[in-house]
């Protein structure tokens, strides 16, 4: 089971209208550049077999991957939203740095790895897709971690 006290974010993180709006605007703009509507990153396959109490830890993994492998490399695109949203998400990642789960997390890593593999396989269009799903990342973090 997760160490719940560390796998939590204060709901105030998700109640800031300005940065919430900027996150959704960034997702919307990137989605307009995403021509691959058949592939889903954040959805039922990601959560399959993961209990509700493990999902904040799961989303921490997705958030860290998205920051390091997608947002940082694409940081010059989708301005001015990117320069505001990346620091916000980085702060959330930092606040989840002590979020771990005890015991076997293989099933979680397997699901996250599938998402990573999909993004990598699609190359730059996979990165654009991940940015286009930042609204879902935001909602998933909020639903799982508050």
């Amino acid at each position: 089971a997760p160490i719940s006290s560390h796998c939590r974010l204060d709901k105030s993180n998700f109640q800031q209208p300005y940065i919430t709006n900027r996150t959704f605007m960034l997702a919307k703009e990137a989605s307009l550049a995403d021509n691959n509507t058949d592939v889903r990153l954040i959805g039922e396959k990601l959560f399959h077999g993961v209990s509700m109490s493990e999902r904040c830890y799961l989303m921490k993994q997705v958030l860290n991957f998205t920051l390091e492998e997608v947002l940082f490399p694409q940081s010059d695109r989708f301005q001015p939203y990117m320069q505001e949203v990346v620091p916000f998400l980085a702060r959330l990642s930092n606040r989840l740095s002590t979020c771990h789960i005890e015991g076997d997390d293989l099933h979680i890593q397997r699901n996250v790895q599938k998402l990573k593999d999909t993004v990598k396989k699609l190359g730059e269009s996979g990165e654009i897709k991940a940015i286009g799903e930042l609204d879902l990342l935001f909602m998933s973090l909020r639903n799982a971690c508050i």
Epitope: F24, A27, K28, A30, S31, L32, D34, T37, D38, R40, I42, G43, E44, F47, H48, S51, M52, S53, G132, E133, D135, L136, F138, M139, S140, N143, I146
Partner: antibody, heavy 119, light 108 residues
Framework: QVQLVQSGAEVKKPGASVKVSCKAS????????IHWVRQAPGQGLEWMGW????????RYAQKFQGRVTMTRDMSISTAYMELSRLRSDDTAVYYC????????????WGQGTLVTVSS | SSVLTQPPSVSVAPGKTARITCGGN??????VHWYQQKPGQAPVLVIY???DRPSGIPERFSGSRSGNTATLTISRVEAGDEADYYC???????????FGGGTKLTVL
């Protein structure tokens, strides 16, 4: 098999409250959000909100804020929706439905509970 | 604000193909789901994520997307397909699911 079974029909007076139950079976209750959706006679579907059975956390549609309360009892795998200060236009069939992520399709629905508000 | 637009009714002869559309502004990164509701019954999910079919739903039911329009296609229509059909997306900007107004499918 996976199912959601709701409580029976209710008749209420304006100003009263109603509490509808939704009993889950055939899956791990805590792993799916329970949503409430209502349908007025001859009308479309209207989302009211969800409860996270694991944490008890809720998210309500703005229209129902302050009037709706969604709860759950983990020990009996049951979710509840209470609507207060009932008006005649609250007459509807109330459905519970489950979803995996909080923003995914509703893959299983309860059979519905007719709530009639009449003086 | 987002609105999903469906035709109020569609009529089709048995054995033919029925197409029900769902239009919305800014559909692009939203997943479209379709529900069938027969009179006096609860809705049933028939298509999710634009084109995926839940187990138990006949292959005659399919979904597709083109730009800002999603389409539910029912091939070789049967009398038992007569029902109301609703499209749905999750609107992240308002953080709630949006339902179309519903389409009544009549089998002639």
């Amino acid at each position: 098999q996976v199912q959601l079974v709701q409580s029976g029909a209710e008749v209420k007076k304006p100003g009263a409250s109603v509490k509808v139950s939704c009993k889950a079976s055939g899956y791990t209750f805590s792993d799916y959000y329970i949503h409430w959706v209502r349908q007025a006679p001859g009308q479309g579907l209207e989302w009211m909100g969800w409860v996270n059975p694991d944490t008890g956390g809720t998210r309500y549609a703005q229209k129902f804020q302050g009037r709706v309360t969604m709860t759950r009892d983990m020990s009996i795998s049951t979710a509840y929706m209470e609507l207060s200060r009932l008006r005649s236009d609250d007459t509807a069939v109330y459905y519970c439905a489950r979803d995996l992520t909080g923003f995914d399709p509703f893959d299983i629905w309860g059979q519905g509970t007719l709530v009639t508000v009449s003086s | 604000s987002s609105v999903l637009t469906q035709p109020p009714s569609v009529s089709v002869a048995p054995g033919k193909t029925a197409r029900i559309t769902c239009g919305g502004n800014n559909f692009r990164n939203k997943r479209v789901h379709w529900y069938q509701q027969k009179p006096g019954q609860a809705p049933v999910l028939v298509i999710y994520y634009d084109s995926d079919r839940p187990s138990g739903i006949p292959e005659r039911f399919s979904g597709s997307r083109s730009g800002n329009t999603a389409t539910l296609t029912i091939s070789r229509v049967e009398a038992g397909d007569e029902a109301d059909y609703y499209c749905q997306v999750w609107d992240s900007s308002t953080d709630r699911p949006l339902f179309g107004g519903g389409t009544k499918l009549t089998v002639l």
